[in-house]
Each structure stands twice: as structure tokens, then as C-alpha cells.
Amino acid sequence: SWMWNQFFLLEEYTGSDYQYVGKLHSDQDRGDGSLKYILSGDGAGDLFIINENTGDIQATKRLDREEKPVYILRAQAINRRTGRPVEPESEFIIKIHDINDNEPIFTKEVYTATVPEMSDVGTFVVQVTATDADDPTYGNSAKVVYSILQGQPYFSVESETGIIKTALLNMDRENREQYQVVIQAKDMGGQMGGLSGTTTVNITLTDVNDNPPRFPQSTYQFKTPESSPPGTPIGRIKASDADVGENAEIEYSITDGEGLDMFDVITDQETQEGIITVKKLLDFEKKKVYTLKVEASNPYVEPRFLYLGPFKDSATVRIVVEDVDEPPVFSKLAYILQIREDAQINTTIGSVTAQDPDAARNPVKYSVDRHTDMDRIFNIDSGNGSIFTSKLLDRETLLWHNITVIATEINNPKQSSRVPLYIKVLDVNDNAPEFAEFYETFVCEKAKADQLIQTLHAVDKDDPYSGHQFSFSLAPEAASGSNFTIQDNKDNTAGILTRKNGYNRHEMSTYLLPVVISDNDYPVQSSTGTVTVRVCACDHHGNMQSCHAEALIHPTGLSTGA
């Protein structure tokens, strides 16, 4: 059987000869050289060589336990002559013994960490870790202890865990933001002779809201022209906050002052400035100076720092309204005037008034915008603003005239304003009523007396206030001995009725009826219209069958004896 124990070998051997490991030996070995010892497995023939006759094993190279702590090899004892193994092939172990040849190495060369400013003493910052490649199961070669070389009195490190904690109260980021801490890890439990490694920990204090906003001045003054429309920025104010990020965010508000309703403040998120803007239209002539109380506050406040005081500040903002040369202002936004259509030229319709709103009260002259009155129907007195006609009017041609009047400061023609004038032309009864259409009707030869053969309608271009009231009658020259009568229906219509039984188209094929239409307005207007009545042959239903076409072709041959 094999005769050996586990082999142990000290690492990092520095001798000049090969390092002796041990001896493989079989009890079958008679010492006569008849056996050959063969080594195979981890490092056989390279790291480990065997004297094939004696079984002595040597290490040819310096071994590093941290690279490989155990080598597993196989041994054979073979009869040189036959190749017959005299023992079963057996596995054996060469265990490399540790020496303290490795210093602790931190997992990072440089650590970065953050901790909130003003943290309590003992607040966790970061944990550093160093590993030692030496054997942790043997001695203290891999027992690491942490200590702080640089960074006191601000930070401390737990010797066993490598946990870095704050060690000083009220560390203020606004005073100092960056700290470089150097931590040492030492093996041998920190004892003399131990190997050590260091790492740098860059610690940044992160901001907390421990500073209120502060205005750099107590009073601000801005000027703005009275013409500034709502929304116009008139000035910027800025409170400073020693904090950063959202802790330095500022909200501005107007809390007091007679300009409370006239101005707004908005916060510019990018610059953290308060922008004072116009809220309502200003008027220098009414108020020349406003004062505002503006407050700057942190929207996010940490309750634990409220003992430091309110996280807001206020400043007074004085706003001076500057006079602007303003255009004249009309007394109305628009004027509506009326005039009768029968007005004579130079009739005054009405007047407009405009005033310079400025303190100077510059005189004003008036004119008509000729683009709005191309036909020059109207004119204006440049001094007093009276509007008058310069041409005759006709309501039936144009009911409304829309013109623009311009008021211009005499001393500064650039300052002008415009106002619309809506002139309504009032109706006058200056048009006679007339037939709504050309009437040409027929009567059957066998018509009976008082038979309605046509209804008449009239139109009138006028537009009387109480509506139209037309009357219809036969013209006086045709009234006696007429074959037809006119019946006024009193509803602005009239009917033509037959006056006898039967008509003979061969005796009289066409009748011309002169009809007088009158209105009842003042002055009364009337006109005469002619209705043509043809005599036709009809069927027993009264449907026309034939008429004399000649009546239409040769009107000169027609009789007028209606």
C-alpha cells in the first residue's frame, strides 16, 4: 500500500534549490529500482517533478497560495519491466500554506458618496470594503481592520465594518461642500507588521433647505409707460437663496400695496426671478405712482429648520407710470345718426366729439376718411365735429351709410384716432305705388257679370312707418261705361270683375283697363297702370281655348274702350 500523508508546502519559497515537497512510497518498493514512480495531475512535470526511482517530489517554481491553494495529483508505482502497477493509482493533495503576502485591496480605488448637510452625528454615509487574498482560515493574515487617515473630525469609520458615518454636528454645505476622506485597511487585525491599503472617499454634502430667500435690497423702483398693455413685463426682482436645486426655488407674490390689483408678479423658473407685469390698463392722468409689497418664499420647506425663522422675505416695489402722448379719445366708441332722405345739401346730421386725454389737452381737428365715403356724400366741420350732407340722399338707393371720422391732434398729426359713424337715411314718401308685375289677363266669351278675372298687387319703394296702404280705382276717363269694374279689397290688393254677361271677341277682342294706384302717405303718391284683358273662346269649364293672336302682334289695332 501507499505510504504518505497530506503534503504541505509554504508559499512564496525563495530558496535557490527546488523546494522539497515530500516522498511518494509504496511498501512494494524493494529499493532495487524495479519500480517507476509516475506523477500526473495539477502541475505534474512542470510545477512538480518526481524522482521516478525514489518517489521524491520537488516544486520547481515559487507557488502562490492566492493563485492556487490546493493541487490534486495522482501517483502511480509501476513495475519498470512489465508496466504492471504495484499499487492502485491514488490521488493525493499538496496544500499550499499561507504567508501574509497580500495587502488588503479596496473594491474601488475611489469611492464617491453623498450625505445630506446638517445630518445628525452617526448618519450613515457609505460602506467601504477591502478584501485580502490571504487565507482567512489561518492566522490573521486576512483579518482586516479599517481606520481613518484623513477626514477627521468630520467623519469616522467603523473598524470592523468599514461603514463611514458623520462625526460632526451641523456640517453646512453652504460653508463647505466637498470632503476627501482617506481610509486605511490593515490586515493582521491592525497589529504591527500588518500590510495595508488605502482608498479615497470623495464625500459631497447634498443640499437641504436650511436657508431662506433674501432680497439683496429692500426697495426696487421701475418705470413703465401708461400705454403698456396687460401682460407687459416692467421689471425683474431677484431674491437669492444659498441653497441649490428645488431648495433654492422661489415663488414670488404681491401681498400688499395700492398696486395689488394693477400689477402681477410671475416667477421665471429658469432664472428664479420675479417678473413684475401690468395686470390692468394704466392711466398716467389718473395715477402716476404705485407701491407694491412683493414676497419671495420657498415652496418646499423642511419643518425641522423652521426654527431658523420664516423661509420668506419681502421688498417694496415702487412703480412710476410715465406719461405717453396719447391719441384723441372720442366720446363714444361709435356714433349712430339719422337724416331724412329729402334733406337738403348742407343739412347738419349731428356731431362727434374727441379730446386729447393728455394733460396738455391738445386741440383736435376732425376729418372724414374718404376711403369710407368715396362719393363725398358727407362732410365734417374740422373744428366742431358737425356732420352735414354734401349731396342729396335717396333711402331707396342706400339705407345706411357707414363712414369713419378721424380726430387728429393739431400739434402732433401723428396722434390720431378713428371712430365709426353709422348714418341711417329715414324714409320720405317720394315713390308712387305701381303694379307688382305686368298684368295681361283674359275673359271668356260666355263669362257672367261680377266674375273675378284677375287680382292685382302693388309695390312701393318707400317704407312708411305704419306700413303700406294702397287704394285701387279705374282712371276717371274709363270709369263711365266700362265693361269691367275694379273692386278694392282694402288689403293692398284689388280684383277686376266682369260687368256684363258675355263678351264677343269678334266685336272686341282686347280691352285696356287704366287703373290708378294711390298710397295714403304724405304727400300722396299715385300712378296709373294698364291691365290688358283679352276675350277668349273657353270650354264649358272656363279653360281658355283660343284668343286672337293678332291682339298681341298688332297692339295698334286694339280698342281702348274698356
Epitope: 529500482g33 509501476i78 519498470r80 519491466r81 512489465t82 508496466g83 502497477p85 492502485p88
Partner: antibody
Framework: EVQLVQSGAEVKKPGSSVKVSCKAS????????MHWVRQAPGQGLEWMGD????????HYTQKFKDRVTLTVDKSTSTAYMELSSLRSEDTAVYYC??????????WGQGTTVTVSS | DIQMTQSPSSLSASVGDRVTITCRAS??????????MHWYQQKPGKPPKLLIY???NLESGVPSRFSGSGSETDFTFTISSLQPEDIATYYC?????????FGGGTKVEIK
């Protein structure tokens, strides 16, 4: 380079003896056993015996035990095989071969021994 | 004595063919996981040449188309792809027990 060089061909009378030499080079002569194998014309291989050059320990096959003698001269790294009482059936090619763990890894070129009256 | 029976005694195969030779020992030639069986090639007029030792180990410088396997009493020698230069007689040999003995040989020819 390992080489085994054998002596030349021999023609012998029945009843006589023959001694074949085998000179080794290219390795440590005393570290390996030397074997002798013969091959009759058209026949297979037949192991005769071997010798340990360091101690001159020998092993013979039963068939040749009384007629074969294996010897070495360490000074010249030469091995010898002597076969006595030759018979016609001893006509064969005789090879020396280096033994290593039961296998023949190097062979001589062979010596033809003819036994004829 | 351990008898070595080799078969076939001769065979003819084409170039590229897989050739298998078996050798049966009359008793086991294995001990402690080592198989004391070796294979040789002999060409006419030349001494034998070691190809495989300890049943399956390829001797240095021998082409990889030659291989061996087996244990105890049954062993196999294989040429994976027969080449023209492989024409020879192949022998098995045991070193387990004196006297060391050879198989009768297998003569390999090309068709």
C-alpha cells in the same frame, strides 16, 4: 536519437551455437530492460527473454531456458544473446528490443540466423 | 502461459475504409485500471513498430487514425480510414505475465 544496431547474419550448423550482439546508443543503457524476440520465416513474433543491464537480472521463456544465455557489457552498452544446440527450426530473424513498462518501443534491425547442415 | 488469439488472420479493405482487429487474451491482462496490452505494425523486411501501448495510448509520432480500446480479456485495434501505407501485419502483445506473448498477427491488404 535511440538506436539499436545488431550484428550481421549468421549461417550455422545444427548443434552449434550462435551469439548475436546488439549495441545501444542515444539513451542510458542501464535504465531499460533489453528483450529478444525472434521471427521464423513467414511466422509470427516469439518472445525469448530479457535482461536488466543494471543488475543483469534475466527472465527466459520456458522453451529456451536451457539453450539461451543473455548477457550485457555495460562499458560498451552492448547486449548479447547466445543460443546453443542449434536446430534447423531455429532458423529465424532475431531482434533485440528496448523494453519500457512492458512494451517494446525501439527495435534492432534484426539478425538472420540460418541453421543448415 | 497467456494465449493471445488475434482475428481475423488477414483482411482486405479499400482505401478510406474503417478496419477493426480484435485480440482476445486467455485471461485478464488488466490490473488497477492499467491494461497491459500493446499493438505493433510490421512491414515486410522491417522490424515491428510500436503503435498503441497500454490498450489505448497512442505512441508519440503515430498518426491519429490508429486507436485502441478494451479491458480485461477483449481488446480492439482500429484504423479509422485505411491508407495505402497501412499495408502490413499487425500484432498484439501482453506484458501482464511471463512469458510475454504475441497474437498470431493480422495481415491487412488493399482491395
Amino acid at each position: 536519437e535511440v538506436q539499436l544496431v545488431q550484428s550481421g547474419a549468421e549461417v550455422k550448423k545444427p548443434g552449434s551455437s550462435v551469439k548475436v550482439s546488439c549495441k545501444a546508443s542515444g539513451y542510458t543503457f542501464t535504465n531499460y530492460w533489453m528483450h529478444w524476440v525472434r521471427q521464423a520465416p513467414g511466422q509470427g513474433l516469439e518472445w525469448m527473454g530479457d535482461i536488466d543491464p543494471s543488475h543483469s537480472e534475466t527472465h527466459y521463456t520456458q522453451k529456451f531456458k536451457d539453450r539461451v544465455t543473455l548477457t550485457v557489457d555495460k562499458s560498451t552498452s552492448t547486449a548479447y544473446m547466445e543460443l546453443s544446440s542449434l536446430r534447423s527450426e531455429d532458423t529465424a530473424v532475431y531482434y533485440c528490443a528496448r523494453g519500457d513498462l512492458g512494451r517494446f518501443d525501439y527495435w534492432g534491425q534484426g539478425t538472420t540466423v540460418t541453421v543448415s547442415s | 502461459d497467456i494465449q493471445m488469439t488475434q482475428s481475423p488472420s488477414s483482411l482486405s479493405a479499400s482505401v478510406g475504409d474503417r478496419v477493426t482487429i480484435t485480440c482476445r487474451a486467455s485471461e485478464s491482462v488488466s490490473i488497477h485500471g492499467t491494461h497491459l496490452m500493446h499493438w505493433y505494425q510490421q512491414k515486410p523486411g522491417k522490424p515491428p513498430k510500436l503503435l498503441i501501448y497500454a490498450a489505448s495510448n497512442l505512441e508519440s509520432g503515430v498518426p491519429s487514425r490508429f486507436s485502441g480500446s478494451g479491458s480485461e480479456t477483449d481488446f480492439t485495434f482500429t484504423i479509422s480510414s485505411l491508407q495505402p501505407e497501412d499495408i502490413a501485419t499487425y500484432y498484439c502483445q501482453q506484458s501482464f505475465e511471463d512469458p510475454w506473448t504475441f497474437g498470431g498477427g493480422t495481415k491487412v491488404e488493399i482491395k
